[in-house]
C-alpha cells in the first residue's frame, strides 16, 4: 500500500499572512531519515514550497530563506507557512519520504485548501 | 516494497521502433500514475509520457507526441511505451516512475513521483 499521510482540509492564514497545519504519516517501517516537502497546487500546476530532511527526534531545518518553519513529534509534523498574501491561496500538499534506512517509502496528503485573505489597509486618521 | 522493472531498451537505427515495458509490483493501490522519464548525459530527468491508473488520463512531452504511445495493462501491473520514428534526440535512459497520488492530485505532476526504476538504455544512432 501506499503510505498513508494524513494532513487537514482547510486552513485559515492568520491576519499576518501565517498558516500552520499538522503533517502526519503512518510509517511502515522505523525511519531514522525523514524528508517533508510542501507542494503547493492550483490550476493543475504544482510548485515546490519548501522542503526539509530530518532525523528522528531531532529539528526540522529549512533553508534559511525559506517561508517554512516546522517541529517533529514521532510521526507528525507540525508545519508553518509564513508571508503568506491572498494570491498565494491554494492546496498545500505535505509529500513524506522515508529515506532510511531502506525501503524508501513515499506518501502524498491530499492537501490543506489554505486561505489567505490580505487585511484592509487601516484608514487614515485625522 | 515498490519495485519497478523497466526492459526493452537497446540500439535502434533513426526511424525504428522499440517497445519498453516496466513490471510493477509491491504497490497494491488501485489508484495512482506511472509513467516513463529520460535522462540523456548531462540533462535533466524529464517526462516523456504518463498514465493514470484509473480512468487512462495520459499526458505527453510536446517532442515526442504523434511518435510515443503509452498503455497500460492492469492485471499485469505493467506500463508500455511505444516508440516509434525514433530519432538521435531520443537517446537517453528511460526510467520508469510511479507516483502514489488520488484523486484531488494533478494528473502526471513530477513532483509526485518518488518510486523509479533502475533505467533501461536507448540509443538511436546509425
Known amino acids: 500500500k501506499a503510505m498513508h499521510v494524513a494532513q487537514p482540509a482547510v486552513v485559515l492564514a492568520n491576519s499576518r499572512g501565517t498558516a500552520s497545519f499538522v503533517c502526519e504519516y503512518a510509517s511502515p517501517g522505523k525511519a531514522t531519515e525523514v524528508r517533508v516537502t510542501v507542494l503547493r497546487q492550483a490550476d493543475s500546476q504544482v510548485t515546490e514550497v519548501c522542503a526539509a530532511t530530518y532525523m528522528m527526534g531531532n529539528e526540522l531545518t529549512f533553508l534559511d530563506d525559506s517561508i517554512c518553519t516546522g517541529t517533529s513529534s514521532g510521526n507528525q509534523v507540525n508545519l508553518t507557512i509564513q508571508g503568506l498574501r491572498a494570491m498565494d491561496t491554494g492546496l498545500y500538499i505535505c509529500k513524506v519520504e522515508l529515506m532510511y534506512p531502506p525501503p524508501y517509502y513515499m506518501g502524498i496528503g491530499n492537501g490543506t485548501q489554505i486561505y489567505v485573505i490580505d487585511p484592509e489597509p487601516c484608514p487614515d486618521s485625522d | 516494497e515498490v519495485q519497478l522493472v523497466e526492459s526493452g531498451g537497446g540500439l535502434v537505427q533513426p526511424g525504428g521502433s522499440l517497445r519498453l515495458s516496466c513490471a510493477a509490483s509491491?504497490?497494491?493501490?488501485?489508484?495512482?500514475?506511472i509513467g516513463w522519464f529520460r535522462q540523456a548525459p548531462g540533462k535533466e530527468r524529464e517526462m516523456v509520457s504518463c498514465?493514470?491508473?484509473?480512468?487512462?488520463?495520459?499526458k505527453y512531452a510536446d517532442s515526442v507526441k504523434g511518435r510515443f504511445t503509452i498503455s497500460r495493462d492492469n492485471s499485469k501491473n505493467t506500463v508500455y511505451l511505444q516508440m516509434n520514428s525514433l530519432r538521435a534526440e531520443d537517446t537517453a535512459v528511460y526510467y520508469c516512475g510511479l507516483a502514489p497520488i488520488s484523486p484531488v492530485h494533478a494528473v502526471c505532476n513530477q513532483h509526485y513521483f518518488g518510486y523509479w526504476g533502475q533505467g533501461t538504455r536507448v540509443t538511436v544512432s546509425s
Open positions: 498514465i493514470r491508473s484509473s480512468g487512462g488520463s495520459t
Open positions: 509491491g504497490f497494491s493501490s488501485d489508484y495512482y500514475d
